[in-house]
Interface confidence: low
């Protein structure tokens, strides 16, 4: 069952995504003028076990005008490794996905991919929020939202964040100010789709293999 709703909207804030739990799917979409190769995969799938996760399948796009030339960047399926660092994570800092067993990293871009990445992800994805440039954060609790399954229904928890103007962008502890924070783009017509910038992080927590859809814009 999909997450029924989009993540909550916080005025003057964007959310970020870092890691994708096993079972997450990423549609193989091509930009205008290109299409998937005939035998190409419809999606990439994050698979594996608790110690090793990677994206199965590869997205490949070819020009719609030609039949025999396949232009592609083959992203290597990204192996999930134990984090080789002693750095302590502060409680509010999003955990780098390399330290999360059973999760895949964001796949590298592939040639001629669409401007929007459409993810189908499992319940339990966590989304972190931060204020856009020009606003500062007033935290009243975790600046995050999790898609949870409760009594057979899905819901997003409410992030405890208010963004107030006239100050510089608030960051997560240990995270630096981005050069630009594009405002959210128009939402898709489909209610389960959220169109946001790829300025996002996502970390996952629950184990339910229910999927939801999450889109990420790419240039």
């Amino acid at each position: 069952e999909l997450c029924d709703d989009d993540p909550p909207e916080i005025p003057h804030a964007t959310f970020k995504a870092m890691a994708y739990k096993e079972g997450t799917m990423l549609n193989c979409e091509c930009k205008r003028g290109f299409r998937r190769i005939k035998s190409g995969s419809l999606y990439m799938l994050c698979t594996g076990n608790s110690s090793h996760s990677s994206w199965d399948n590869q997205c490949q796009c070819t020009s719609s005008a030609t039949r025999n030339t396949t232009k592609q960047v083959t992203p290597q399926p990204e192996e999930q490794k134990e984090r080789k660092t002693t750095e302590m994570q502060s409680p509010m800092q999003p955990v780098d996905q390399a330290s999360l067993p059973g999760h895949c990293r964001e796949p590298p871009p592939w040639e001629n991919e669409a401007t929007e990445r459409i993810y189908h992800f499992v319940v339990g994805q966590m989304v972190y929020y931060q204020c856009v440039q020009g606003y500062r954060a007033l935290h009243r609790g975790p600046a995050e939202s999790v898609c949870k399954m409760t009594h057979g229904k899905t819901r997003w928890t409410q992030p405890q964040l208010i963004c107030t103007g006239e100050m510089e962008t608030s960051q997560f502890p240990g995270e630096e100010k981005p050069q630009a924070s594009p405002e959210g783009r128009p939402e898709s017509e489909t209610s389960c789709l959220v169109t946001t910038t790829d300025f996002q992080i996502q970390t996952e927590m629950a184990a339910t293999m229910e999927t939801s859809i999450f889109t990420t814009e790419y240039q």
Partner: nanobody, 122 residues
Framework: QVQLVESGGGLAQPGGSLRLSCAAS????????VSWARQVAGEGFEWVSG???????YYADSVKDRFIISRDNAKNTLYLQMNSLKPEDTALYYC????????????????WGQGTQVTVSS
């Protein structure tokens, strides 16, 4: 203030080599995945190569076995060793940084440089 400053571009002959550098400042470089991307005039961005904070490296097929990406966290610098250059490598090369993911353009990177021009011509 966050800065990514690319250098090392220039004119090279086909088959020649160049080494690009990207000096980072204003953020914790070692915590970020960093990438090289390129843009040919009038066209979109093409992701070239990237390296995660733990050292994992990835390459586009078009540069695999010719380009080598590396990072020096002590110097807050990203490198791209470009060997066996081809005319089609001619482009403006950018470095970008993003937390936990490889990125390919000013829209998808958290931080983005100004670029350095590479021209491969005889």
């Amino acid at each position: 203030q966050v800065q990514l400053v690319e250098s090392g571009g220039g004119l090279a002959q086909p088959g020649g080599s160049l080494r690009l550098s990207c000096a980072a400042s204003g953020f914790t470089f070692s915590n970020f995945a960093v990438s090289w991307a390129r843009q040919v005039a009038g066209e979109g961005f093409e992701w070239v190569s990237g390296v995660y904070s733990d050292g994992d490296t990835y390459y586009a097929d078009s540069v695999k076995d010719r380009f080598i990406i590396s990072r020096d966290n002590a110097k807050n610098t990203l490198y791209l060793q470009m060997n066996s250059l081809k005319p089609e490598d001619t482009a403006l090369y950018y470095c970008g940084a993003a937390r936990g993911r490889l990125c390919s353009s000013i829209m998808t990177c958290d931080y983005w440089g100004q670029g350095t021009q590479v021209t491969v011509s005889s």
